[in-house]
Interface confidence: low
Amino acid sequence: THLGIRLPLRSGLAGPPLGLRLPRETDEESEEPGRRGSFVEMVDNLRGKSGQGYYVEMTVGSPPQTLNILVDTGSSNFAVGAAPHPFLHRYYQRQLSSTYRDLRKGVYVPYTQGKWEGELGTDLVSIPHGPNVTVRANIAAITESDKFFINGSNWEGILGLAYAEIARPDDSLEPFFDSLVKQTHIPNIFSLQLCGAGFPLNQTEALASVGGSMIIGGIDHSLYTGRLWYTPIRREWYYEVIIVRVEINGQDLKMDCKEYNYDKSIVDSGTTNLRLPKKVFEAAVKSIKAASSTEKFPDGFWLGEQLVCWQAGTTPWNIFPVISLYLMGEVTNQSFRITILPQQYLRPVEDVATSQDDCYKFAVSQSSTGTVMGAVIMEGFYVVFDRARKRIGFAVSACHVHDEFRTAAVEGPFVTADMEDCGYNIPQTDESTLMTGRA
């Protein structure tokens, strides 16, 4: 990912779930024992502040040291602050842990802007509002960083939930989730419900409010409405998927579908925006502009640099179109579409100068590293990372912010031929170059 707009450096994710709870509908899928049902202890275990990501509480070491850890499906290292830093209220103190083991190996992770570096080790790790297990996991103890930690963000580390292929320093460093599944009977699946606020929160509200749920080992019925639709994981590195069609308010962008996945399309909870390849971004903005032409917005707004504000409570949501992404389905020549609202892609921000207004940033932006389905997408949906069956599921989130006319939607099936051709094949020679740009 282009790390200038990836968390934790970057423009942020919307906060806690103040959207509407939708009624449950009948799920058409068959039950799978041990994979679905109620995970009460894990519901509402995430918190987040607009612009600063979603984090879960974890404990590390013996006796346990409690830290808040950013949930990131776009990287694969478990890395925590392990030295004093002006932005950290607490950090992992290895010397106080009787179970810490030093791997005598360093790790250096450069970003487009900033970096972190540290020392590798292992220790006992658990998630208090997660499964009742303790595992020994690899930990990167961050000793130095630049533009990584965020002042006031309330998290002290990052939990990379993607695959070993993109782990640093190399793919021999087993990611946390792999360790968890290997050492326990927990099924190889997790699911995320990120709940955007829909409007800015002051600091007290943001800290006190719930931000969503990370369900480890299964699927919780109460977190979504309708049915789950699955798209294959194309390759196990990032959570890579294939987009086969894009529509703005039902109007097809009519581009070669390879453009949508150039050079990849990933689902990334550590990125704020819906990020689109240059050509796709330009076409999408042109279409969104046309659909919302009843009001004129400065170019800076469409570039994500400028806010637009309306008097509190009067945001004209309905002049903005819906955005639909069609994803490859599990059945040959079958796709399904996920549709997000302006309530997802206009990100609420606090504008101190005009605190009586509701102000927003346009949270669709340009990418040079493919499509990134960040929080803007994920906040509309309950997203199931079914690693065991190499697929990602989407259903309408029970906490997504919407209005009285439209809700986010997951609909299908649609007939789409030659979907395999939509995937971009990265030339081998380029791959190592691409990998140096992110965590």
């Epitope: 509407l20 659909a291 009843t294 509190a312 004209p316 949501w317 309905n318 002049i319 209005d403 009285e404």
Partner: antibody, heavy 120, light 108 residues
Framework: QVQLVQSGAEVKKPGSSVKVSCKAS????????ISWVRQAPGQGLEWMGN????????TYAQKFQGRVTITADESTSTAYMELSSLRSEDTAVYYC?????????????WGQGTMVTVSS | EIVMTQSPATLSVSPGERATLSCRAS??????LAWYQQKPGQAPRLLIY???TRATGIPARFSGSGSGTEFTLTISSLQSEDFAVYYC??????????FGGGTKVEIK
């Protein structure tokens, strides 16, 4: 300032249909929802459904599902509400109202109302 | 659907006095509530939205409060033109956007 002007009073026979129009003037029509609300004599307000002309799809209250059709014509800035299989209890004043499409969806501009009498 | 209950059905108040109208939701609607005023033979008029924000042109004597399931509309000093029926409406779930049964404010 947006104004909503509704069609005139109607007298209908049971089992027939009625179509009430609501013309918007003085402001944007397409991107704001038009809701229909009815009020039987001496009774309270009852929300029937709404439509956003730019999207064309209507949402209906369960009670009226299958009997009501809400449409809009962007070219004339007019919304329509058609109620079929009329019965005496459908005698009411039918209002159209605009919702600003905001976070709250309140009905901020109302038509003057159309009296529909269903009588044999 | 969410049921909105208004009380009292009728409120008798003298001009210049304070009137307090209540609206209760069968489940939490957050601050997603509006109040409307309706005079005989007229269409309703929006008074309050977002539970407490006055609509454009509404006098300051009208104020709304509450969140969740309990809401109040207060008219601090009743004027002759305020005698009317008042409705609350939940703006939280749909369809339908349910209204309360109304409170008639009459001259004592």
């Amino acid at each position: 300032q947006v104004q909503l002007v509704q069609s005139g009073a109607e007298v209908k026979k049971p089992g027939s249909s009625v179509k009430v129009s609501c013309k918007a003037s003085g402001g944007t029509f397409s991107s704001y929802a038009i809701s229909w609300v009815r009020q039987a004599p001496g009774q309270g307000l009852e929300w029937m459904g709404n439509i956003i002309p730019i999207f064309g799809t209507a949402t209906y209250a369960q009670k009226f599902q299958g009997r009501v059709t809400i449409t809009a014509d962007e070219s004339t800035s007019t919304a329509y509400m058609e109620l079929s299989s009329l019965r005496s209890e459908d005698t009411a004043v039918y209002y159209c109202a605009r919702s600003g499409g905001t976070k709250y969806g309140m009905l901020d501009v109302w038509g003057q109302g159309t009296m529909v009498t269903v009588s044999s | 659907e969410i049921v909105m209950t208004q009380s009292p059905a009728t409120l008798s108040v003298s001009p210049g006095e304070r009137a307090t109208l209540s609206c209760r939701a069968s489940q939490s609607v957050g601050s997603n509530l509006a109040w409307y005023q309706q005079k005989p033979g007229q269409a309703p008029r929006l008074l309050i939205y977002g539970a407490s924000t006055r609509a454009t042109g509404i006098p300051a004597r009208f104020s709304g409060s509450g969140s969740g399931t309990e809401f109040t509309l207060t008219i601090s000093s009743l004027q002759s033109e305020d005698f009317a029926v008042y409705y609350c409406q939940q703006l939280y779930t749909w369809p339908p956007r349910t209204f309360g049964g109304g409170t008639k404010v009459e001259i004592k």
